[in-house]
Interface confidence: low
């Protein structure tokens, strides 16, 4: 005799009893009414299962909650199924067997026929696990059922001191969907919240789980697929306050079926977004957007933000949204990079874009901007990176495209190519009134518009000029004069400089900022406009440094241990961290601080000039870094503002030194022999280069490096020209992640010391 191998299969679900109604007592597990009714309902459920062929496998069951409307019973039951039959008894098959029994004319005296009028249509059976039951049981001491009426905002209170875990069973009207809002109120927290697309905590129906405070998402809104949701709130150790506000409401289903016809222009024409954006998209999301282009000259570009698409094997589910575009199946995934999906138009002028959630696990709502591009020239003057659909500068010495194709097959890399014989000359020699090419092609078209390219400056009227770095050089190169606008910047207040020295003189670096918490210098920064200071995002990565309220910004400061008449201080009203900043890779290491009141410029306080995206800082050029950072690795911060000259380093050299961890948003400066470098406390401070006009331009922000001044390891700086679009967007009020926006962090807000 051989014992049959069985496996415990857990099912969870609900059924509606048409001849019973919900009462408040039934919503409280501790009430006598609940105990009595749940025992009877459990017996009824047991009889129902037993009367089908599942009866021989029955192990146990429980009715753990009741809900509104005709009385809804929420239950689980366990069947011990022979191993060989496990796959045949899916939730669908089990439901069918139970429904058939409910609809049968059998003359049974079982309570599901005599006492309870069970609605077969309303029977729900879901797959569950033993672990789901364990989680459910751990919350039953703090189980709260709430019916969410339309128009009502229901606050959910956290576990009290006695309980560590609570479960809300939320239910709303059948034609509405449950939406939970979670708003962080504290900087430090260890609580966990999990939301499920079911009445109970079924792992396979998890929508999202949150642990610790997220500065990236100070407010989260999460949608269920329908009118039921379970929320489990597990209190962290030593957590005495609710770290967030939790509330819930019932909302109408929002349609996302759109038909659009685009106009024949190349700028952004609008956006597509999932229902209730920026709420998490619902597990039942199915959007269908049909876009028509005006002619086959155009292709369609979809511009994503921190989200990208990639091909996925057909047998694999998309875990962050499925996209169907022109019969191509793509999976969405979160990324801290920009991405564009380009859709070529070949035979038809229309394209349907379908977005579907394939699993219950969802994520932040998706918003995608759309525009047209010229199919014959998708990136005028630039290179189309097929990996991410972006137009990137070509042959500028920086591999912007992940596969580096933008720097392949270059005749002249980061130089000007003479038309006569393809000789390469350095960019500063272009339009300098000195012919360098054989027939002087470097000095042609210097007073007229030229096709836009990697090193051409784009004027406000979108025309381009050939002369490199024409901004604020005292000569009007653009027809509209825009290259000489916003030029109240980059001039030193006092010109006496200690050449070769290390101590700065007053007014020498009038844009230098000292960012302090409680009187202690933490990071450097630079004044770029009358209410804006730029610095490094990593200065704010500790949870204890994340709030703008903590910071004081000093401008015109010389010495840390004393004040003098030329210095002024400001509080910070808002903090913007670059939304793509990644702590581990140091990528996009830039932040903007909005000061609480405007700066009055003086000889000791004035802004540095911001470079255009096309501004070329030539490798080998000598530039300057300033700050109060340590004067040796591991040493204390300096009292007096220090300055040091460093040489800009070619990207590939630096990339090799750091084993290819240097992104296009990074710039390297220093010396192979080391010695001169930024150090702890200099983070966020400016790397500035002087143009022939005498004006100083911000090339970089002190970001990271291996030690300080070590041979073969240069200082790594945030490359300002690669984040200038975001800077301008924030300065003109166009967003960027305000009031925070970084991941969970764990190293010091000073020059990274590895």
């Amino acid at each position: 005799y051989k014992a049959e191998v069985t496996v415990s299969q857990v099912y969870s679900g609900s059924l509606r009893v048409l001849n019973r109604h919900f009462s408040q007592d039934l919503g409280r597990r501790e009430s006598i009414a609940f105990r009595s009714e749940s025992a009877k309902a459990q017996k009824m459920l047991q009889e129902l299962v037993a009367s089908t062929r599942l009866g021989t496998y029955y192990n146990s069951s429980s009715v753990y909650s009741f809900g509104e409307g005709p009385l809804t019973c929420f239950f689980w039951f366990i069947l011990d199924i022979p191993e060989y039959q496990r796959l045949t008894l899916s939730p669908e098959v089990v439901r069918e067997l139970l429904v058939d029994e409910l609809l049968s004319n059998s003359s049974t005296l079982a309570s599901y026929k005599t006492e309870y009028e069970v609605d077969p249509e309303g029977l729900v059976i879901l797959e569950a696990s033993v672990n789901d039951i364990v989680v459910l049981n751990s919350t039953l001491g703090c189980y709260r059922y709430s019916y969410v009426n339309p128009g009502q905002v229901l606050p959910l209170k956290g576990p009290d001191q006695q309980t560590t875990s609570c479960l809300w069973h939320l239910q709303g009207p059948e034609d509405l969907m449950i939406k939970v809002r979670l708003e962080w109120t504290r900087v430090d927290c260890r609580d966990r919240v999990a939301m499920y697309d079911a009445a109970g905590p079924l792992e396979k129906r998890l929508i999202t789980s949150v642990y610790g405070c997220s500065r990236q998402e100070p407010v989260m809104e999460v949608l269920a697929s329908g009118s039921v949701m379970a929320v489990v709130w597990k209190k962290g150790m030593h957590s005495y306050y609710d770290p967030f506000l939790l509330s819930v409401k019932s909302v109408a289903f929002q349609d996302c079926q759109v038909n659009l016809t685009l106009e024949g222009r190349l700028d952004t024409q609008g956006f597509l977004r999932t229902p209730y954006y920026p709420s998490y998209y619902s597990p039942s999301t199915h959007c269908s957007w049909h876009l028509t282009v005006p002619s086959l000259d155009y292709g369609l570009a979809l511009w994503f933000d921190a989200y990208a698409l990639r091909r996925q094997k057909y047998n694999r589910l998309c875990t962050q949204g499925q996209w169907m575009i022109q019969n191509r199946r793509l999976c969405g995934f979160r990324t801290l990079q920009p991405y564009a999906e380009r859709i070529p138009m070949v035979a038809s002028d229309g394209v349907t874009i379908n977005f579907t959630s394939q699993i219950s696990l969802t994520g932040p709502g998706v918003q995608v901007y759309y525009s047209l591009y010229n199919q014959s020239d998708p990136c005028p003057g630039e290179f189309l990176c097929s990996v991410n659909g972006l137009c990137v500068p070509a042959c500028d010495g920086i591999k912007d495209c992940p596969n580096g194709l933008d720097e392949r097959n270059c005749v002249c890399r980061a130089m000007f190519q003479c038309q006569e014989d393809s000789t390469c000359i350095s960019l500063p020699r272009v339009c300098d009134r000195q012919p360098d090419c054989l027939n002087g092609s470097d000095e042609e078209q210097c007073q007229e518009g030229v096709p836009c390219g990697t090193f051409t400056f784009q004027c406000e009227d979108r025309s381009c000029v050939k002369k490199p770095n024409p901004e604020c050089d005292g000569q009007s190169d653009c027809r509209d004069g825009s290259d000489e606008q916003h030029c109240d910047c980059g001039l030193q207040g006092l010109s006496s400089r200690i050449v070769g020295g290390t101590v700065s003189s007053e007014g020498e670096w009038p844009w230098q900022a000292s960012l302090q918490i409680r009187g202690r210098h933490i990071c450097g920064g630079a004044l770029i406009a009358d209410r804006w200071v730029i610095t490094a995002a990593h200065c704010f990565q500790e949870d204890s440094m994340a709030s703008p309220k903590l910071w004081t910004v000093f401008l015109g400061k010389m010495r840390q241990n004393s004040r003098w008449p030329g210095e002024v201080s400001f509080k910070v009203s808002r903090l913007f961290l670059h939304p793509y900043h990644e702590e581990d890779s140091h990528d996009y290491d830039v932040a903007l601080l909005q000061l609480d009141h405007p700066v009055v410029y003086s000889a000791t306080v004035r802004p540095v000039c911001l470079p255009a995206r096309s501004h070329f800082f030539e490798p080998g050029q000598h530039c300057w870094i300033t700050g109060w950072g340590a004067q040796r690795e591991g040493g204390p911060v300096s009292n007096t503002l220090q300055k040091v000259d460093v040489q800009l380093v070619p990207q590939d050299l630096c990339s090799e030194a750091y084993r290819y961890q240097v992104s296009p948003r990074m710039l390297c400066a220093g010396y192979r022999k080391g010695k001169k470098d930024a150090c702890q406390g200099d983070s966020g401070g400016p790397l500035v280069c002087r143009e022939p006009s005498g004006r100083w331009f911000l090339a970089g922000l002190v970001s990271w490096g291996l030690g300080c001044g070590r041979p073969n390891f240069f200082g790594v700086y945030t490359r300002v020209t690669r984040v200038i679009n975001w800077i301008q967007q924030v300065l003109t009020g166009g967003g960027g992640s305000g009031g925070g926006g970084s991941h969970h962090h764990h190293h010091h807000g000073s020059h990274h010391h590895h």
Epitope: R310, R311, Q312, K313, Y314, S386, V387, N403, G404, L405, R408, N409, E656, Y660
Partner: antibody
Framework: EVQLVESGGGLIQAGRSLRLSCAAS????????MYWVRQIPGKGLEWISS????????AYADSVKGRFTISRDNAKNALYLQMNSLRAEDTALYYC?????????????????WGQGTTVTVSS | QSALTQPPSASGSPGQSVTLSCTGT?????????VSWYLQHPGKAPKLMIY???KRPSGVPDRFSGSKSANTASLTVSGLQAEDEADYYC??????????FGGGTKVTVLG
């Protein structure tokens, strides 16, 4: 079963043309960069050409540039190599190979599935 | 693009280790981390053993390991077995979407 089968080889006179085909099965063809690699009998391997999934990036070895053309038909799960102006030194066993399976947008420059090869003999 | 340099032959007794070298330039092996190693038995198609310098495809025994230093990549076969007797080829990405192979090393298992 993942499989690549080359065909179209044979004996050909120098200066003439030949078209090699490679039939793919058992995997999603349009998710892979594809390669042609050749091997002169008793000698080493030589990369000839590669083509990305959308045919948007194509590359050739200097030794065949201007004479050979790689193409693919994703609908037919087929890879081709059109060889013109053949020379005696093109005599070799020609393999079709696919890029290593993995993340779709990532390049490995490694070939994890190879065909058995088709022999091309160019007589002068 | 010129071929990578591999020694024509190498040998070892069963159970021993053998290390094969593959020398390129700063434009291929030295610049990119896309070095692969292939094994080829006579009359058979090559088989991928290592990719991205040191990663093993599934199914390849952990006796095979890869590394790189400057412009030279290495393949070490430890615990040599009779079936390891074959030709071994290295390859590297060489920029501009081009791949370059080595001339191959014939590995003989003695005894």
């Amino acid at each position: 079963e993942v499989q690549l089968v080359e065909s179209g080889g044979g004996l050909i006179q120098a200066g003439r043309s030949l078209r090699l085909s490679c039939a793919a099965s058992g995997f999603t063809f349009d998710e892979h960069v594809m390669y042609w690699v050749r091997q002169i009998p008793g000698k080493g391997l030589e990369w000839i050409s590669s083509i990305t999934w959308k045919s948007d990036i194509i590359a050739y070895a200097d030794s065949v540039k201007g004479r050979f053309t790689i193409s693919r038909d994703n609908a037919k799960n087929a890879l081709y190599l059109q060889m013109n102006s053949l020379r005696a030194e093109d005599t070799a066993l020609y393999y079709c190979a696919r890029e290593k399976d993995g993340d779709f947008y990532y390049y490995y420059f490694a070939m994890d599935v190879w065909g058995q090869g088709t022999t091309v003999t160019v007589s002068s | 693009q010129s071929a990578l340099t591999q020694p024509p032959s190498a040998s070892g007794s069963p159970g021993q280790s053998v290390t094969l070298s593959c020398t390129g330039t700063s434009s291929d092996v030295g610049y990119y981390n896309y070095v692969s190693w292939y094994l080829q038995h006579p009359g058979k198609a090559p088989k991928l053993m290592i990719y991205e310098v040191s990663k093993r495809p599934s199914g390849v025994p952990d006796r095979f390991s890869g590394s790189k230093s400057a412009n030279t990549a290495s393949l070490t076969v430890s615990g040599l077995q009779a079936e390891d007797e074959a030709d071994y080829y290295c390859s590297s990405y060489a920029g501009s979407n081009k791949v370059v192979f080595g001339g191959g090393t014939k590995v003989t298992v003695l005894g």
